[in-house]
């Protein structure tokens, strides 16, 4: 396992469980998830005397990492004292230290609610010269709180003397005000009110709202996947609207057909994104025959915040057709990963670009999440190509050493599918008539990564190539004997001829 620094947690009792006449009390510090041994735990007990005991490290079964607990027992006026547990892990780095400062016990408390309010625009909807942000920290059990204002995550130098605290019944509230210039507010920075209380952090953030007519709203209309169209025979098209500003008004998506014929019932999904925008998806089932015969489907989008409606259309791709060529390869064993192998599938020279790629094992289709397939890219000619990559385990290939890469494409005959079988250990595989041993053309790869070199940003393949078992009748086209480089600006995807 690689070096891993520990996570450090304070261990305390609930105050109500400690007898009021207790003369000594024990608290602890947990260091967990580190590798390798050892950690060094020391305590700062202030003016009090204490005895410490560090328990032997235990191994965490799943990760192989370590955990240890250090206990501190103190006597005397411990109630008002803060204690610091200092954990050092020199294997991470000579100066790696994590400090945790805490009191002997934790009280039951009601945490605060943190909410930022902002001053209004003027009557004309414009921002005034200064904007006030008010941080309301409410409904917490009285106690010390610290308020910090952050601008894009950086602590701001703010006069906090204006913060005022009030108490209502058993709970307290505090408010802090931040005044910003219009320039700072309009600069699209995020302002955060961060509250530290009882060793916990609570916060709320705000920024200038998006304009009421969002610039970036985009709509996309997909074609049905060949798998849905030809195999499942239940094709759907999807209208995707992204980057909408969330608002009271809802997005209205209306489906229609250019022929004027009625459309099926669609399903709709709305998702709030991390950046605060809304994504709306509407999926419409279409008739297989209607689609193949060239019907045009339209998705019309309206929204209260869009000055105009927008429409997207989709129909079967026109132009020449070409069936895909499918080549499947197993990468050689790589030192240190004997129980895993990568299978690669090159599918090329197909037109149009719509294609579905599946992997099968034991005649069962593997979940899409198991494999990674590139988007179709243009070849030097007029067709398209994709790569698909599947990682398989020893357990799988020992159960049955035959994996099938299947391409579903409208130009493939007779049944819109072309497939190739590949074995991890070709010499040992029984396989079917369709099985193939490893080709005599193999994938070059860098010293760092087994399998396909990564596209953009990946390393250039190492000139020393690893060879699979020789094979004279591999069905690949002759041009694969020479180096093929696809797509400018990317690490070349290189194939070598006879090793």
């Amino acid at each position: 396992a690689s070096t891993q620094s520990p996570s450090v947690f304070p261990l305390t009792r609930c105050c109500k469980n400690i007898p009021s006449n207790a003369t000594s009390v024990t608290l602890g510090c947990l260091a967990t998830g580190y590798f390798p041994e050892p950690v060094m735990v020391t305590w700062d007990t202030g003016s009090l005397n204490g005895t410490t005991m560090t328990l032997p490290a235990t191994t965490l079964t799943l990760s192989g990492h370590y955990a240890t607990i250090s206990l501190l027992t103190v006597s005397g006026a411990w109630a008002k004292q803060m204690f610091t547990c200092r954990v050092a892990h020199t294997p991470s780095s000579t100066d790696w230290v994590d400090n945790k400062t805490f009191s002997v016990c934790s009280r039951d408390f009601t945490p605060p609610t943190v909410k930022i309010l902002q001053s209004s625009c003027d009557g004309g909807g414009h921002f005034p010269p200064t904007i006030q942000l008010l941080c309301l920290v409410s409904g917490y059990t009285p106690g010390t709180i610290n308020i910090t204002w952050l601008e894009d995550g950086q602590v701001m130098d703010v006069d906090l003397s204006t913060a005022s605290t009030t108490q209502e019944g058993e709970l307290a509230s505090t408010q802090s005000e931040l005044t910003l210039s219009q320039k700072h507010w309009l600069s699209d920075r995020t302002y955060t009110c961060q509250v530290t209380y009882q060793g916990h952090t609570f916060e709320d953030s705000t920024k200038k709202c998006a304009d009421s007519n969002p610039r970036g709203v985009s709509a996309y209309l997909s074609r049905p996947s060949p798998f849905d169209l030809f195999i499942r025979k239940s094709p759907t098209i999807t209208c995707l609207v992204v980057d909408l500003a969330p608002s009271k008004g809802t997005v209205n998506l209306t489906w229609s057909r250019a022929s004027g014929k009625p459309v099926n019932h669609s399903t709709r999904k709305e998702e709030k994104q991390r950046n605060g925008t809304l994504t709306v998806t509407s999926t419409l089932p279409v008739g297989t025959r209607d689609w193949i015969e060239g019907e045009t489907y339209q998705c019309r989008v309206t929204h209260p915040h869009l000055p105009r409606a927008l429409m997207r259309s989709t129909t079967k791709t026109s132009g020449p057709r070409a069936a895909p060529e499918v080549y499947a390869f197993a990468t050689p064993e790589w030192p240190g990963s004997r129980d895993k192998r990568t299978l690669a599938c090159l599918i090329q020279n197909f037109m149009p670009e719509d294609i579905s790629v599946q992997w099968l094992h034991n005649e069962v289709q593997l979940p899409d999440a198991r494999h990674s397939t590139t988007q179709p890219r243009k070849t030097k000619g007029s067709g398209f190509f994709v790569f698909s990559r599947l990682e398989v385990t020893r357990a799988e290939w020992e159960q049955k050493d035959e994996f099938i890469c299947r391409a579903v494409h409208e130009a493939a005959s007779p049944s819109q599918t072309v497939q190739r079988a590949v074995s991890v250990n070709p010499g040992l595989a029984g396989g079917s008539a369709q099985s193939q041993r490893a080709p005599d053309r193999v994938l070059c790869h860098s010293g760092q990564q087994q399998g396909l070199p990564r596209a953009a940003g990946g390393s250039v393949p190492h000139p020393r190539c690893h060879c699979g078992a020789g094979r004279a009748d591999w069905p690949g086209p002759p041009e694969l004997d020479v180096c093929v480089e696809e797509a400018e600006g990317e690490a070349p995807w290189t194939w070598t001829g006879l090793c």
């Epitope: 007519n213 339209q298 209260p304 915040h305 869009l306 105009r308 409606a309 429409m311």
Partner: antibody, heavy 119, light 110 residues
Amino acid sequence: QVQLVESGGGLVQPGGSLRLSCAASGFTLSNHDMTWVRQAPGKGLEYVSIINTYGNHWYANWASGRFTISRDNSKNTVYLQIDSLRAEDTATYYCARETHHGSSGIDHWGQGTLVTVSS
Amino acid sequence: DIQMTQSPSSVSASVGDRVTITCQASESIYSGLAWYQQKPGQPPKLLIYDHSTLASGVPSRFSGSGSGTEYALKISRLQPEDFATYYCQHADYAHHSDNVFGGGTKVEIK
């Protein structure tokens, strides 16, 4: 067939107000975003305002404040109220229908109504 | 605001000539560039929408092209009825601005 007929133009003194009307027929008004465009004599086309099917409106920056667009789908009519008229507001005002699929331009225009601001 | 700059402001041509009018947007248009033809005393008429789609009833000698910020209207063989003023317009669904129309190009008889 689709028809847009503007009315309400005429000669008005500077500082005065006008309410232009656009009577729509031959289509369902509520399905379309509607726009007012003006053209000063011998000059190019100038966008004034748009109102979408939800009744929300947008204005060219220079028009904000003095111009008010509205629609009454039940009366098949779109309006443009112009206040504090100035000499530079002299123009032919066209009522126009945005294409149903939107973001594609204006597929039908009225013949326009001439507004002349002069003392 | 997106500004539309149309050029040339006028062009002299003869019947049968090929004429190209360009329109440059100050920033990329998400969708909906349209071209109009206007004759004196008449309202404009939609020729092309969505950058390149011919409006109903418009002759095929008119064509539109372009993407991003650069657009063009081409008249392959000028006919007598084509002498008019042409305007481009961005009809972006997500935006409005002061100058959605280009300044216009007058196509005159040489």
